[in-house]
């Protein structure tokens, strides 16, 4: 008997949908694998007789409930299929947005860039796919634990009236209010404010 693939899971970030698994212990030799997807009642091959332990399913519709399966093979023998179900629009992980930060006196000016859909050639982003897309921003004084959160209305935000000559750190994530789903935080960007621009009277 050929043992089935182990730890079968979908690793999907920004609709880059990679089915991954681990090769089971098998004494007779090296296993190959076949991965398939269900398309109108018929399973179609996606990766056939591959020695890899992953298969790219990024071409699948973002909006469908998909059944995927993978099995191990050796010579004329094969394992049972291992099935998983996957709905990209519900299950994909929302990667971190990009962020540009500029210091102007005692203000931080931020611009946010929604993550690009990984498997597409043009410039569609996660914001295109999700109608309710918004951003969460959190910021804090460097070296302190207290964090402040805001939800910008647009693709930019300004933090005003900050303490001068103080380093602030900022990070951003995508958030879908209608799904109560949050994306991954971007890496913090830390910048030092300069002087307070108010002129003494």
């Amino acid at each position: 008997m050929v043992p089935p693939p182990e730890n079968v899971r979908m690793n999907s970030v920004n609709f880059k949908n990679i089915l991954q698994w681990e090769s089971p212990a098998f004494a007779k030799g090296n296993l190959t694998f076949t991965a398939q997807y269900l398309s109108y009642r018929i399973f179609q091959d996606k990766c056939m007789n591959t020695t890899l332990t992953e298969c790219d399913f990024s071409s699948l519709s973002k909006y469908g409930d998909h059944t995927l399966r993978v099995r191990a093979e050796f010579a004329d023998e094969h394992s049972d299929w291992v099935n998983i179900t996957f709905c990209p629009v519900d299950d994909t992980i929302i990667g971190p947005p990009g962020m540009q930060v500029e210091v102007l006196a005692d203000s931080l000016h931020m611009r946010f860039l929604a993550p690009k859909i990984e498997n597409e050639y043009e410039t569609w982003t996660m914001k295109n796919v999700y109608n309710s897309w918004t951003y969460n921003v959190q910021y804090w004084k460097n070296g302190t634990d207290e964090k402040f959160q805001i939800t910008p209305q647009y693709d930019f935000e300004v933090l005003r009236n900050l303490e001068p000559w103080t380093t602030y750190c900022v990070q951003v994530r995508g958030f879908l209010p209608d799904r109560n789903k949050a994306g991954e935080w971007s890496e913090p960007v830390c910048e030092q404010t300069t002087h307070d621009e108010t002129v003494p009277s």
């Epitope: 398309s39 179609q44 699948l60 519709s61 973002k62 998909h66 859909i117 597409e120 569609w124």
Partner: nanobody, 126 residues
């Protein structure tokens, strides 16, 4: 929400022509990948032709040189011009759409599309 409505089906003699249309509403139409599929009684749904948002096209081998897919972004409409029709082209023809996509895949399998029309019947008699 994407909505698709096919029209233009009908009965035709072998060797004749038809033009199918698919009116789309919903997302920004220019972002769609769109395709035509068909399903004959007792058979599986199969890809006929597809067009990506960048205009690249792909066709099933059985229709190459006879069918042509196109879309009019201004009218939000997809077309399938069918010529030299054969009895084996008889089927229910479906329009499918996948928003926010482009080229890079053949887009001729049903699982690549999230939205579907109700279909229009094409009958070719010998």
């Amino acid at each position: 929400q994407v909505q698709l409505q096919e029209s233009g089906g009908g009965s035709v003699q072998a060797g004749g022509s038809l033009r199918l249309s698919c009116a789309a509403s919903g997302y920004s139409y220019s972002s769609y990948c769109m395709g035509w599929f068909r399903q004959a009684p007792g058979k599986e749904r199969e890809g006929v032709a597809a067009i990506a948002s960048d205009g690249s096209t792909s066709y099933a081998d059985s229709v190459k040189g006879r069918f042509a897919i196109s879309k009019d972004n201004a009218k939000n409409t997809l077309y399938l011009q069918m010529a030299s029709l054969k009895p084996e082209d008889t089927a229910m023809y479906y329009c499918a759409a996948e928003p926010w996509c482009t080229g890079g895949y053949s887009r001729l399998t049903p699982a690549e599309y999230g939205y579907w029309g109700q279909g229009t019947q094409v009958t070719v008699s010998s």
